[in-house]
Amino acid sequence: AVDLTLLANLRLTDPQRFFLTCVSGEAGAGRGSDAWGPPLLLEKDDRIVRTPPGPPLRLARNGSHQVTLRGFSKPSDLVGVFSCVGGAGARRTRVIYVHNSPGAHLLPDKVTHTVNKGDTAVLSARVHKEKQTDVIWKSNGSYFYTLDWHEAQDGRFLLQLPNVQPPSSGIYSATYLEASPLGSAFFRLIVRGCGAGRWGPGCTKECPGCLHGGVCHDHDGECVCPPGFTGTRCEQACREGRFGQSCQEQCPGISGCRGLTFCLPDPYGCSCGSGWRGSQCQEACAPGHFGADCRLQCQCQNGGTCDRFSGCVCPSGWHGVHCEKSDRIPQILNMASELEFNLETMPRINCAAAGNPFPVRGSIELRKPDGTVLLSTKAIVEPEKTTAEFEVPRLVLADSGFWECRVSTSGGQDSRRFKVNVKVPPVPLAAPRLLTKQSRQLVVSPLVSFSGDGPISTVRLHYRPQDSTMDWSTIVVDPSENVTLMNLRPKTGYSVRVQLSRPGEGGEGAWGPPTLMTTDCPEPLLQPWLEGWHVEGTDRLRVSWSLPLVPGPLVGDGFLLRLWDGTRGQERRENVSSPQARTALLTGLTPGTHYQLDVQLYHCTLLGPASPPAHVLLPPSGPPAPRHLHAQALSDSEIQLTWKHPEALPGPISKYVVEVQVAGGAGDPLWIDVDRPEETSTIIRGLNASTRYLFRMRASIQGLGDWSNTVEESTLGNGLQAEGPVQESRAAEEGLDQ
């Protein structure tokens, strides 16, 4: 199980002194700087128990493996569910603490209930402040059951849950119907995935027999030991005031673990520290009791005395949980409670024993989980002990589990179980990811998902040109860093593979799948320059450029023109996909805009140096169209046009332009300027008789505006052929602008 403890300080006289601390004993826990070590998270979980919003809680990190939550301002801030998450990958674990208000109407007799699959769980809510109304039980925030207030038994409301299954796990609450939810009794029910004493898929494996109140984990068969105990079977007591899987942590403050609730990974739940009991963990154990919540009884024999933290303290000549074993009986010494090896390795395991008579090589044996017995290949005999060495055959996954070292002499026998974890070297499930590429280097992210077991100690990146038979180049990198492959050939495909390793002999995994990464083209080096440009309309610009002459083929696929509109903060990019092109027409520009213009050569995805920029001002767009244009024939050669000025003018009109065209004619139209912008009529002269004409107009301010509607009119008959139309405005002759 993950070495993760959530501590709640229950000295509740002042909520501002209340704190929660999450402590991880995992290697590298809480670093959070890379994908291999996510941070410890400690938070209030408001999904089930919602409390009124208050000021945000303060989270303080103390080193890499501890995080503390403070800033509780009122007692209601404390009520509810808190969780700490730690461990990496598949070992990521959530530890949960449920806090009850000491002033609630209903109080739990016991907050955490850990039961086996198929058991009957009984949750008991003690009446603290009576109300004569229904009691509603909820499970994970949803309605579960109702009890009449008359149904209390000895001042307690009981919820019986027969034949519980793992989905029944969760937060239960008992609340008087018309009371505040904060006055509820909150419980945590943990249902192991197996029946008593069993673990594993199908619950076929036997638990190691956890001591001192340890709980067998239904997934891995490990004992989750109560705070203050350690060892594969929780057989060893820590020194007073210490906790953690290796007793490595110390309770804060001068009164040791008094007033602290300890929450551990499921299926353990929460309890007081060793030697303490009571709803606030402030009461010392009664004589003859010891351990977490004082749940254990000493029953010491042969003159042993009961210590409330560790149990029986035996006089010399005796050992065992109850001082029931004589020291003449052989004893396994200093056996590690857990060993880790990599798959398919052939490790050596040592087992030391002492006793009277003295154990010899043949009296010590090693038993594997499948019952196979290994005999030692050699033994080292010292004055105080014999150490037997066992050569283990090539390990397979089925060797994971509890091994046993057993010593037998005429004085008796002793055995010690220890956990062997056979770890699978990591194998990448995916190819490495290309982050960026240049012509001579590739930047690669080697962090990929993997099968097998972590932690990852090293990452090797193997690479060589595609279709090459040359040796692979290898680079060893830190797991958390991106890798730059240097000195590569441009425009070349490289096959790249990742190999991961975990600690220990034989920890190198197989190579991951290959991926093809291609270096970029050579960068284009030529810098174009802008030859010129001219405006072809209020929104059109023709640009031309040149390139320096250099020997050899041109390295480039085309040109990129960039127009920067500084006023609006917008960039327009125009791709010219021929490297031979030296001119381009840019359309759809914004009239009246000041643009900065440059051009650069591109090759593949790489851009060459930009030309020196040019600054171009497009003329503004013209005014709206004149309104209500009307044509009226005056004679066989004259037509009068009348109109109304455009609306919403952006400035004074400088002139009008009339377009004249013979209806159905194929020739170009004629443009005639009306240079008196105040006028609203004009006469077009010199037209042909009996001819149908089309007219339209537009105004000009700084640029020409929109055309008006087109009107048709025919000249009167019997006239002579005219030289061409001219215009008169209020009897003033004007020139022709074609």
Epitope: D134, I136, Y143, F144, Y145, T146, L147, D148, H150, E151, L177, E178
Partner: antibody, heavy 117, light 105 residues
Framework: EVQLLESGGGLVQPGGSLRLSCAAS????????MNWVRQAPGKGLEWVSR????????VYADSVKGRFTISRDNSKNTLYLQMNSLRAEDTAVYYC??????????WGRGTLVTVSS | DIQMTQSPATLSLSPGDRAILSCRAS??????LAWYQQKPGQAPRLLIY???HRATGIPPRFSGSGSGTDFTLTISSLEPEDFAVYFC???????FGGGTKVEIK
Amino acid sequence: EVQLLESGGGLVQPGGSLRLSCAASGFTFSRYPMNWVRQAPGKGLEWVSRIWPSGGSTVYADSVKGRFTISRDNSKNTLYLQMNSLRAEDTAVYYCARDSSRYFDVWGRGTLVTVSS
Amino acid sequence: DIQMTQSPATLSLSPGDRAILSCRASHNIDNFLAWYQQKPGQAPRLLIYDASHRATGIPPRFSGSGSGTDFTLTISSLEPEDFAVYFCQQRTNWLFGGGTKVEIK
């Protein structure tokens, strides 16, 4: 689908008896309090009786106290109302209703009881 | 006993109108009040509980407010299917109000 289905209604003479049943499905019947609510023709709703999930506690409206008995069989997911000494004013559609916090969140379609000579 | 009084007895409105229904308790009932809708020939349906919480599946045009003795059910914009009888109920002794009929004008 959560469902309640009443049965057992009919025509009965004053002073007679009738037993209504309500079959529950689609939820864990044994965990919920159950109620009978009635509605006289063209009138409003009147709560009649409630039974707690265990069956150990019951409560009645004053108008039916001593004449009606509510019961349940959790193994059969069924609620009952035994009605004795029936009166003309007991004529109504009788609904069975589930409650979780003394509000009726699931109702049956009702069964008509007519008390007439 | 706490008595529940609903007003008006009948409310004549058109689709799209806003409907405001009132329920008064004879004593303080905090927010322990529910509203139900009943259409002809059908069982009642829970709309609002604890004075202001919409029951599952109830559209947002239905809203409840009030606390103590005065409570209101508001239908923001009447749909054709909303024309029905509405009852309030206090949960202490399961007493219902006399009902308000919302009919088409």
